[in-house]
């Protein structure tokens, strides 16, 4: 709960953001989870805590592990975990999955190409943008701000995208790279309030006690490629994680389709032998973008066996 | 545009309870604390105390400890704030306010007039 | 507790030109992390309180840039530089520093 995963480069710059947020928050407290010792303030350290962020300046392999942040604040202390990973330099061109981030969509009218967690960082442009390792030359590509903008992109811009940039800490200087992959949509679009197609709003569905069941959260966000949209379940108003049932899982990533044009998201939430008390539970399906929340709520019903007679 | 909707007001008699909601809407209910207010016009603006949705957690004046219980429900994005063993002391608006990350009381609902009389 | 305090009233002011609002903590809102933990909030007649200063010196989303505030750990002000009519109501001072959390007794804005 309240952990999120980090990676890195060895001999790179690595900042993490702690995974809870105050609200507000008025210090933040970074411990090493396995010995419990607390990280330095002092930026003297190769690795040292600033506010909301831990920094590796630069990451080592050994520093791989679980980091414990305590936001703190005058009403209430929370806790997060930070999963770090530091990796070996790869040395082929080969960015081996692990090491990628999400992939990003563009089209004709909007191929911008963000680098993954820059805002994190102290740097200067420009930004130094290389595809499937090769740096990327010619008057298309403009490195702009912390993304890259292609000009009349095509199918063959798909690929794999490292950005890199120097951040800069009292005046040392620590190179950083990301990778994200790049599809290539051929559509223009438009994005609007999030439309859920499925469920619908406070349905009832029948179920079977000890069967499999599955519901599927579907929403449409506009047309075209969807830079911030999200469909997911909760259970009571918790998240799928955080509720503890093994039984019941969210299909793991989001499906997209393009239903008349449109941009949709699928999420199935998958039930596993279902019980009495799943029925007691309220599923909401929630669907966000940058214009809002939408959500509708589903509730299970016992549905009775069918008995086949010969 | 985030928004606090409040319960209406409320007449109830000395000793008795109520329970005063607060439903937010247009922002993820988890991401805020929801605090409550209370105004008159001898004591001013007073501090009640918080509510974290996200977990439950909860921060009390000391001075309205045993008088208000605060609870949230997740599902409906509803904040609740029970008053019990009500006395005169009691009539006021009551505020409920929702944080940011830079600030406690950075959303208000409407306010419910409470009034407790015989 | 944090007593923060306020006078009932202002200056009469004329709309046009600036007003002061004074605000006394009984201890030093200033943290360790740096941040002077003052807020400025506005009831006008009939409604809610309302944001208007946060961390003693920046502006809220949505409030005009006539208000501003400047203090020192423990003495505080704010200034409206062009009295507008809709300014009108009372100016509440809080502190956020540690629990309870406690606000100003009010100073009310007259215009003239």
């Known amino acids: 709960k309240f952990s999120k995963q980090s990676w890195g480069l060895e001999n790179e710059a690595l900042i993490v953001r702690c995974p809870r947020q105050g609200k507000p928050s008025y210090t933040v407290d970074w411990y090493y989870s396995q010995t419990n010792k607390s990280i330095p303030t002092q930026e003297r350290n190769r690795v040292f805590a600033s506010g909301q962020l831990l920094k590796f300046l630069p990451a080592a392999v050994a520093d791989s592990g679980i980091y414990t942040c305590i936001v703190r604040s005058p009403t209430f202390n929370r806790t997060g975990y930070a999963n770090v990973t530091i990796y070996k330099k790869q040395s082929d061109c080969n960015v081996p999955d692990y090491l990628m981030y999400s992939t990003v969509s563009g089209s004709e009218k909007n191929s911008k190409i963000y680098c993954p967690t820059i805002d994190l960082y102290n740097w200067t442009a420009p930004l130094e943008w290389f595809k499937n390792c090769q740096a990327l030359q010619g008057s298309r590509y403009r490195a702009h701000k912390s993304f890259l903008v292609i000009d009349n992109v095509m199918t063959e811009d798909a690929g794999d995208y490292t950005c890199k940039f120097i951040h800069n800490e009292n005046g040392a200087n620590y190179s950083v790279t990301a990778t994200r992959s790049f599809t290539v949509k051929d559509e223009q679009g438009f994005s609007l309030f999030p439309v859920i197609g499925a469920p619908a709003q406070n349905e009832i569905k029948e179920v079977e006690i000890g069967k499999n069941a599955n519901l599927t959260c579907s929403a449409c966000f506009g047309k075209g490629t969807q830079f911030l949209a999200a469909v997911l379940w909760q259970l009571n108003g918790t998240k799928i994680t955080d509720f503890g049932e093994p039984r019941i899982q969210q299909e793991e990533g989001q499906n997209q389709s393009f239903s008349n044009g449109l941009a949709c998201l699928d999420m199935v939430l998958r039930i596993a032998d279902v019980k009495e008390e799943d029925l007691l539970l309220q599923y909401d399906c929630l669907a966000l973008n940058l214009h809002g929340l939408r959500r509708h709520t589903v509730r299970l019903s016992r549905k009775n066996p069918i008995d086949h007679h010969s | 545009q985030v928004q606090l909707q409040q319960s209406g007001a409320e007449l109830v008699r000395p000793g008795a309870s109520v329970t005063l909601s607060c439903k937010a809407s247009?922002?993820?209910?988890?991401?805020?604390?929801i605090h409550w207010v209370k105004q008159t016009l001898v004591h001013g603006l007073e501090w009640i105390g918080a509510?974290?949705?996200?977990?439950?957690?909860?921060a009390y004046n000391q001075k309205f400890k045993g008088k208000a219980t605060l609870t949230a429900d997740k599902s409906s994005s509803t904040a609740y704030m029970e008053l019990s063993s009500l006395t005169s002391e009691g009539s006021a608006v009551y505020y409920c306010?929702?944080?940011?990350?830079?600030?406690?009381?950075?959303?208000w609902g409407q306010g419910t007039t409470l009034t407790v009389s015989s | 507790d944090i007593v923060m305090t306020q006078a009932a009233f202002s200056n009469p002011v004329t709309l046009g030109t600036s007003a002061s609002i004074s605000c006394r903590s009984s201890?030093?809102?200033?943290?360790?992390?740096?941040?002077?933990?003052l807020y400025w909030y506005l009831q006008k007649p009939g409604q809610s309180p309302q944001l208007l200063i946060y961390?003693?010196?920046n502006l809220a989303s949505g409030v005009p840039d006539r208000f501003s505030s400047s203090g020192s750990g423990t003495d505080f002000t704010l200034r409206i530089s062009r009295v507008e009519a809709e300014d009108v109501g009372v100016y509440y001072c809080?502190?956020?520093?540690?629990?309870?959390?406690?606000f100003g007794s009010g100073t009310k804005l007259e215009i003239k």
């Open positions: 961390q003693m010196s």
């Open positions: 247009d922002y993820i209910f988890t991401d805020s604390e």
């Open positions: 809080a502190q956020n520093l540690e629990l309870p959390f406690t």
């Open positions: 509510i974290d949705p996200e977990t439950g957690d909860t």
């Open positions: 201890k030093s809102l200033l943290h360790s992390n740096g941040i002077i933990y």
């Open positions: 306010s929702g944080s940011t990350t830079d600030c406690y009381f950075a959303y």
